[in-house]
Amino acid sequence: DITPSVPPASYHPKPWLGAQPATVVTPGVNVTLRCRAPQPAWRFGLFKPGEIAPLLFRDVSSELAEFFLEEVTPAQGGSYRCCYRRPDWGPGVWSQPSDVLELLVTEELPRPSLVALPGPVVGPGANVSLRCAGRLRNMSFVLYREGVAAPLQYRHSAQPWADFTLLGARAPGTYSCYYHTPSAPYVLSQRSEVLVISWEDSGSSDYTRGNLVRLGLAGLVLISLGALVTFDWRSQNRAPAGIRP
């Protein structure tokens, strides 16, 4: 029963491979890899890429085989595939391999990035979208705001990222995010670097206020000058004939 790590092309339909409790776990957890064939099989094999022979066998007259990985270590993480055989297929013949299952055994998930879309500067009344991006699909993402103990928003995402919308008026502040596996046993990521969201050029309002004052003063000066010119003109119109300025 020595076979290549990915058995030769076969016309027998591939099985499905899944992991319980999850494909991302912390070290020490017991993981069950379940290989389900679309028809009853006689023998199931669990394969790892680059290895000559199946890692494990299960002889079961059934459509389902379970491979038990006890108290997994990070070294047991990686890619797995399974195949099955039926007695009427002849020696060495396996089904097509299942799709690859990636098992990740880690204490902590990689740190996500947090960016603002379209940018970290918010105009009056405009909303801003924060994207928390990790490396894994089907994770739960959590957004935090500095100074607020409870999470601000949760999102479960099939993509390796999640978008959080902030309403313009409340947007400015300091944010961070992290992600975790959607179900127990939970594996958490590190927190992202903080992201500061600010009003559109916070200094510009001061300049505007100053300019308004200057414009007002200039207006007053012009009005005053206008009044003086008018007064002078009227005075001259009342003067005796023969006298000119």
């Epitope: 027998h12 339909p13 099985p15 389900r36 064939a37 679309p38 028809q39 009853p40 007259s61 459509e63």
Partner: antibody, heavy 118, light 106 residues
């Protein structure tokens, strides 16, 4: 959408052979398995066999010696051939689609009636 | 081969009544699947992998069980539920069906 449609001779004499065609649309025969199931009048369902996407077959061992399933991928057709027919082979013959890894039938054809009688 | 025994063979229920039918396997199976068939029509996938409802199946239906004992339950019978229900396994060759439970409206 997915459709399966059976067509057959309707009436066959005892000891003769049967050929039924299942014409499919909405999916490729190179992707999924197609099964044959029959149902005698007023009775339950009996599985006959399956033609897998890759061209391999499984048969009900009780009928294996009389059964043959083949297909033509380009015409999207699966064929059931059965010889040495007896009156108790009279039934409604269905083809059914198995889409995924689950060992059940996602879609069924409307069926074709076969009567074995002299 | 695995023999699936469905009981009762025939039953009747009034609208709103709870209905339970069973499927007993002669050997342990991993999953049980159920089909609904109305007179003159082909079967329809109804419940798959023991407890999952097929698309379009009302939520009043449910499936449960393990090993050799499985059941289909209707929480509140409706007129459109009158049909014959078949259980099916393929944990072992050959693929087999139960003889069916015919559910009639009282």
């Amino acid at each position: 959408q997915v459709q399966l449609k059976e067509s057959g001779p309707g009436l066959v004499a005892p000891s003769q052979s049967l050929s039924i065609t299942c014409s499919v649309s909405g999916f490729s025969l190179t992707s999924y398995g197609v099964h044959w199931v029959r149902q005698p009048p007023g009775k339950g369902l009996e599985w006959l066999g399956v033609m897998w996407a890759g061209g391999s077959t499984n048969y009900n061992s009780a009928l294996m010696s009389r059964l043959s399933i083949s297909k033509d991928n380009s015409k999207s057709q699966v064929f059931l051939k059965m010889n040495s027919l007896q009156t108790d082979d009279s039934a409604m013959y269905y083809c059914a689609l198995q889409k995924g890894y689950g060992n059940y039938f996602d879609y069924w054809g409307q069926g074709t009636t076969l009567t074995v009688s002299s | 081969q695995i023999v699936l025994t469905q009981s009762p063979a025939i039953m009747s229920a009034s609208p709103g009544e709870k209905v339970t039918m069973t499927c007993s396997a002669s050997s342990s199976v991993n999953y049980m699947h159920w089909y609904q068939q109305k007179s003159g029509t082909s079967p329809k996938r109804w419940i798959y992998d023991t407890s999952n409802l097929a698309s379009g199946v009302p939520t009043r239906f449910s499936g449960s069980g393990s090993g050799t004992s499985y059941s289909l339950t209707i929480s509140s019978m409706e007129a459109e539920d009158a049909a014959t229900y078949y259980c099916q396994q393929w944990s072992s060759d050959p693929l087999t069906f139960g003889a069916g439970t015919k559910l009639e409206l009282k």
